[in-house]
């Protein structure tokens, strides 16, 4: 560093835990949503909701920010005819996505709020409420039953009545479907013309019950029971139904595939193709066979359109196809062999001829990169728009491809926005315009573009306040590197202090996630507790996407099948070894952290020996670690380890109990909320039993009655401080030891 640079850096503040929770660092997402060819709705930083017309360059206020504030509303939604707004308030989270809340309707712009309730109850807490696709039609869900309202002011009618609280869910996910299968609490789907509603009926009656304890707030602790299928136990059963909303409500079940491999199945995707045809993906329990069908909503008959099979497991089963207007042509993503690195995810088009039962299938894209999302299909312009990793696995650029002729590809976002390589996007209904959301590496921003020439029309949100805060701080320097293991090039991300010099010795913190198919090394903007470790406490943080990670081909992804932990340990240790070769890393101060599956891995690799058979890690921490996959969710564990009960060797081999007996003097901090509904405290209890048996050193920090996702910001702040303090202390102890050792050496001299 030149002295000038050094001075400017020294004047900059370090990133603190307070910063993580301050308004200065809060990214504002306008949540812009196209509602027509030329208009989108978005929310300003001050809270006002506006409608913007990109052709006339004018905006209209729909809801004043003050109104949202006065209602104490958490969420808002505007009716398709823009006459009414639906607000939710007093919202209570249930699981990751689901919540209950009170709802009110209000005429735009200044109408008085009117409560939304089922006919039989007033002031009811609803599980869901939302507009349909047309006019003012809306549905809401109360006590697992679905109610329909044709327009505001009309009496709601109950259209599905089979619900049973906590047992039979209509139009909503149970725990497993919300967390592992659909990855949303919403399990209902409107037909595009608003005449029909498809909904999932999920039956948990045979699923074993888990009880979450509540220790505080009453003299005797209470429990909250809910159905949670652990590996090998009875799973929820699911059926898909369609009800007609014009006239008497006729309920019709869509018939699952008649296939012996589908004796037990999940429904992973539902998407309307036309107003009478609905696409459904059915996945067998073993998650190695999936069938995509097109179901006739008037008869319930489902026709097979595509089948997928895997020797390992089928990944990315939630993705929705994109249809032509008549539903005869659809684009979907599937894994296609691309040579040595296995399969990569590419766009395939399936076209059916009017008088033929055979569908013509063609690949639109190919190469050793992944299409990560299909965004839109311009039928008139014969173009498909998508995001992909073609640039680099750690990036997401926006591309278009011709859907006729030579399938020519064009990158629309490459070099379009400065300091932006990781994008998401959405297109106006006519595809003439698109909203481009930059997610990094620079401060996130949202811009509006003309599709014809990619030209930026205007900035919708630039988050200038965050840019300013970032410029005033000593932000980490980010570097990328690849490491070579067994014919694989594995990406690594290194965060170094802003004042980094290679003559100083820095502690090393390895942060692991490693959930199969996930990605830790990405060019996304992030300010987290890791940033604080680097900026305020001079640590070097490293992340590595090893075998089992996503976006680098299915060969790499599927390597971990039936042996979770084994190869990830090798790869993460190789990343550490690579870093330890650097002069600037202090090999006596090396730590590891992970949460959830990453907590499993951090616990798994903490005892790992270095090249000289000495311990590599000084300390480690795990937040809500999975410690035994037979205690974890059926859909997750069975996907990677097979069906528990058929062959349990994989389950036995992956237990961390076998590893922790090798823990020596390392400090080990385990953190677990006691009401964790996803990874039960039971995992930590089992682990600690083994640690005690092995006379290992550990500390345990619990969060009484807190759930997995730490919804309270004060608790989150406490959590981050705890983790940071643990590592700072761990690194400081080594400082003391080094000083003592140095003094002893001097005395000997």
């Amino acid at each position: 560093l030149t002295p000038a640079e050094d001075n400017s850096l020294s004047q900059k503040k370090k990133v603190t835990v307070e910063d993580l929770f301050s308004e200065d660092f809060k990214i504002h997402d306008p949540e812009a949503k196209w509602i027509s060819d030329t208009e989108f709705i978005y929310r300003e930083q001050k809270g006002t909701v506006r409608l913007w017309n990109v052709e006339t360059n004018t905006s209209t206020v729909l809801i004043e920010g003050k109104k949202i504030e006065s209602l104490r509303a958490i969420r808002y939604e505007i009716s398709p005819d823009r006459e009414y707004a639906l607000f939710s308030y007093n919202v209570e989270p249930i699981y990751q996505h689901s919540y209950t809340g009170y709802y009110v309707l209000s005429k735009i712009p200044h109408g008085d709020p009117q409560s939304l309730d089922p006919p039989e109850v007033s002031n009811a807490k609803l599980q869901y409420a939302g507009w349909g696709p047309k006019g003012q039609q809306l549905i809401f869900i109360f006590e697992n039953n679905i109610y329909y309202c044709a327009h505001v002011g009309k009496q709601a009618i109950r259209v599905v009545s089979t619900g049973k609280e906590g047992v039979i869910y209509n139009g909503l996910s149970d725990w497993l479907y919300e967390e592992e299968i659909l990855k949303t609490h919403i399990a209902h789907w409107w037909s595009p013309d608003g005449t029909r509603l498809a909904y999932a009926a999920i039956n948990d009656s045979r699923v074993p019950i888990m009880e979450l304890p509540t220790y505080t707030g009453s003299i005797y602790p209470t429990v909250k029971p809910y159905h949670y299928p652990k590996a090998g136990s009875e799973n929820p059963s699911i059926s898909l139904h369609v009800i007609g909303l014009n006239g008497p409500t006729h309920d019709l079940e869509m018939m699952p595939p008649d296939d012996p491999r589908m004796r037990e199945y999940y429904i992973t995707m539902v998407k309307w193709a036309t107003s009478t045809k609905v696409a459904v993906t059915w996945l067998n329990r073993a998650q190695n066979v999936s069938i995509l069908t097109l179901c006739d909503a008037t008869t319930g008959v489902c026709t097979k359109k595509h089948e997928d099979e895997s020797e390992a497991w089928l990944h990315r089963q939630n993705e929705e196809p994109v249809f032509s207007k008549d539903g005869r042509k659809f684009f979907f993503i599937r894994a296609i062999p691309q040579g040595g690195r296995g399969k990569f995810y590419h766009i395939t088009v399936s076209s059916s001829q009017p008088n033929s039962s055979n569908d013509n299938i063609q690949s639109i894209t190919s190469g050793d990169w992944d299409v990560t999302k299909i965004l839109a299909y311009d039928e008139k312009g014969n173009k498909i728009y998508f995001l992909s990793t073609e640039d680099l696995p750690r990036r997401r650029q926006l591309y278009s491809a011709n859907t006729v002729g030579n399938f020519n590809r064009q990158c629309l976002s490459c070099d379009l926005v400065e300091n932006c390589t990781y994008f998401s996007a959405s297109f106006s209904h006519s595809m003439d315009f698109f909203l481009l959301k930059c997610e990094g590496p620079g401060v996130p921003m949202v811009t509006v573009h003309n599709t014809t020439d990619k030209k930026k029309m205007f900035d919708l949100e630039t988050n200038e306040h965050v840019k300013k805060a970032i410029n005033d701080r000593q932000m980490p320097k980010v570097e990328y590197r690849d490491i070579e293991i067994d014919d694989y090039n594995l990406p690594m991300q290194i965060l170094k202090p802003a004042t980094f010099t290679d003559t100083t010795h820095y502690p090393l913190l390895l942060v692991v996630d490693g959930t199969p198919g996930s990605q830790s090394v990405a060019e996304k903007f992030e300010v987290s507790w890791e940033t604080v470790m680097v900026s305020s406490h001079g640590a070097v943080v490293v992340k590595c996407d090893g075998r089992g990670s996503g976006f680098q081909g299915t060969k790499l992804l599927h390597e971990v099948r039936r042996r979770l932990g084994l190869l990830e340990e090798k790869d993460q240790m190789e990343a550490v070894r690579t870093m330890l070769k650097e002069q600037y890393i202090d090999r006596t101060r090396v730590a590891v952290f992970g949460k959830d599956y990453g907590g499993y891995l951090s616990t798994y690799i903490l005892p790992a020996k270095g090249e000289n058979q000495g311990q590599t890690f000084t300390c480690g921490s795990a937040l809500s670690p999975i410690t035994d996959f037979k205690l974890y969710a059926s859909a997750f564990s069975e996907r990677y380890l097979g069906l528990h009960g058929l062959d349990n060797r994989a389950y036995e081999m992956t237990k961390v109990a076998h590893r922790v007996s090798a823990l020596e003097e390392q400090q080990f901090l385990i953190i677990h909320p006691t009401a964790d509904e996803k990874i039960h405290f039971q995992h930590t209890a089992e682990l600690i039993t083994q640690l005690i048996r092995g006379k290992a050193n550990y500390s345990l920090q619990i969060y009484p009655d807190e759930s997995h996702y730490f919804t309270s910001s004060s608790l989150k702040q406490h959590l981050y401080r705890s983790i940071i303090n643990f590592f700072v202390e761990c690194f400081r102890i080594q400082d003391k030891l080094l000083t003592v050792t140095a003094k002893e050496d001097e005395e000997e001299d």
């Epitope: 509602i35 027509s36 060819d37 030329t38 208009e39 017309n53 052709e55 006339t56 005819d81 823009r82 006459e83 047309k134 006019g135 207007k325 008549d326 008139k380 106006s428 209904h429 006519s430 003439d432």
Partner: nanobody, 130 residues
Framework: QVQLQESGGGSVQAGGSLRLSCAAS????????MAWFRQAPGKERERVAS????????NYADSAKGRFTISQDIAANTVYLQMNSLKLEDTAMYYC???????????????????????WGQGTQVTVSS
């Protein structure tokens, strides 16, 4: 709550005239692609004429050129179809359709199929007799 309401249909002699009206809610009307479609018994619904309410640009199907005129009254949120020199083959149910927030250029060049439109009226019958 009705988004579009047609009126003005009826029976007329060949060679005669009729004026159809389509009243829209302010939302359905503003900056929309408004179109008149017709459907004769046993035939598919076809577009007759369309107008972009933001720009006033109009477009006609070949069968309507020179005989029909689409126009609008912005203050009344109403679109009209003036039909002159009516022929027997003009007998059909006439529907008003709207695509709110339409791109102006797309309205007059691309939007010709029923699935391009979001909102529909109930229809008004036009019968031409000899």
């Amino acid at each position: 709550q009705v988004q579009l309401q047609e009126s003005g249909g009826g029976s007329v002699q060949a060679g005669g005239s009729l004026r159809l009206s389509c009243a829209a809610s302010s939302y359905t009307y503003s900056y929309s692609c408004m179109a008149w479609f017709r459907q004769a018994p046993g035939k598919e619904r076809e577009r007759v004429a369309s107008i972009h309410t933001g720009t006033g640009t109009a477009n006609y199907a070949d069968s309507a050129k020179g005989r029909f005129t689409i126009s609008q009254d912005i203050a009344a949120n109403t679109v009209y179809l003036q039909m002159n020199s009516l022929k027997l083959e003009d007998t059909a149910m006439y529907y008003c359709a709207a695509r709110p927030g339409s791109a102006a250029l797309r309205c007059t060049t691309d939007y010709s199929k029923p699935h391009d439109f979001t909102y529909w009226g109930q229809g008004t019958q036009v019968t031409v007799s000899s």
